[in-house]
Amino acid sequence: QGGTRSPRCDCAGDFHKKIGLFCCRGCPAGHYLKAPCTEPCGNSTCLVCPQDTFLAWENHHNSECARCQACDEQASQVALENCSAVADTRCGCKPGWFVECQVSQCVSSSPFYCQPCLDCGALHRHTRLLCSRRDTDCGTCLPGFYEHGDGCVSCPTSTLGSCPERCAAVCGWRQMF
């Protein structure tokens, strides 16, 4: 009282930090610093982040909240989790689509676009690995289909159809003689 030296940062608890003249308690996640504390070890004036903005961490210095990201519709992105005061929008791909990173060293913050997953059924193949973080992994041809070039061809239903060796092995055509 009445002195002129600013007090040392000697506050109970570990969430105090010097802001201007005094050691202040910071703002919780989801709040920005409106004004620093006005006395030693005091509480700063903190306000809730306005709509469409967020701050994910406790902080002593942010005088404004970060703007929530908008998912890129051009890249077919959708919001998996909406933005809140404490967390940014989480963008991803809708079911049936997978993330294709736009950079070689892919991390969670890397730009990406969404690609439709391969439909193994439409290719007459077994699904070996379901599509989520990467494209669907298709396996061998479904029963009633055989490998021909890059695709699966339907087994012939009559003797008029030609049945090469691979076809015969899969379709059992020779057993029909």
Partner: antibody, heavy 116, light 107 residues
């Protein structure tokens, strides 16, 4: 709109007293620390006193310690400076200022003249 | 007490000139430094806080930089309405102290 309006200045003889007031409006007065800063004629700015938002902590420049008292009434949105044992060197324009780290809002000032 | 040494004490420049004012603190004040503009007969006006943070509504031709003990205030292109006295101020420690001011006039 944030406004700070000082009043109470005037002429006084050496050894006399004055009480300055600062009326605040347009913001939550009780959330902010407040200060008095003065400026002698043709001179620079001199900080003289600070009071915390609750009024529980006060600080003074050595030049006024023991003679000036800062106080506030949050119910009335008002800041005060009681000046006793005034000297010729206290002649200045007195400003109240809002503390937000820096002094982000100032009043227009009230002049005090100490002369015999 | 922390002594704030501001220079130059006065300067004359032409409209459109780049103007630089420096402020030196007698000890480390981190970035707790502000710059004020004061026109004759008026109250000071905060331009920059935290050494480089431009206040809302202040023209972008004003800028500040520095940390620790050495700070700079710049007007990138001087305008006639910038004629005023400019002060630096530290709020790292009580007592709060100001530089002695820089009086800026037009050539």
């Amino acid at each position: 709109e944030v406004q700070l309006v000082e009043s109470g200045g005037g002429s006084v003889q050496p050894g006399g007293s004055l009480r300055l007031s600062c009326a605040a409006s347009g913001f939550t007065f009780s959330s902010y620390g407040m200060s008095w800063v003065r400026q002698a004629p043709g001179k620079g700015l001199e900080w003289i006193s600070y009071i915390s938002s609750s009024g529980g902590h006060t600080y003074y420049a050595d030049s006024v310690k023991g003679r000036f008292t800062i106080s506030r009434d949050n119910a009335k949105n008002s800041l005060y400076l009681q000046m006793n044992s005034l000297r010729a060197e206290d002649t200045a324009v007195y400003y109240c200022a809002r503390y937000s780290g820096a002094f982000d809002r100032w009043g227009q000032g009230t002049p005090v003249t100490v002369s015999s | 007490d922390i002594v704030m040494t501001q220079s130059p004490s006065s300067l004359s420049a032409s409209v459109g000139d780049r103007v630089t004012i420096t402020c030196q603190a007698s000890q480390d004040i981190s970035n707790y430094l502000s710059w004020y503009q004061q026109k004759p007969g008026k109250a000071p006006k905060l331009l920059i806080s935290d050494a480089s943070n431009l206040e809302t509504g202040v023209p972008s031709r004003f800028s500040g930089s520095g940390s620790g003990t050495d700070f700079t205030f710049t007007i990138s292109s001087l305008q006639p309405e910038d004629i005023a006295t400019y002060y630096c101020q530290q709020y790292d420690n009580l007592p709060i102290t100001f530089g002695q001011g820089t009086r800026l006039e037009i050539k």
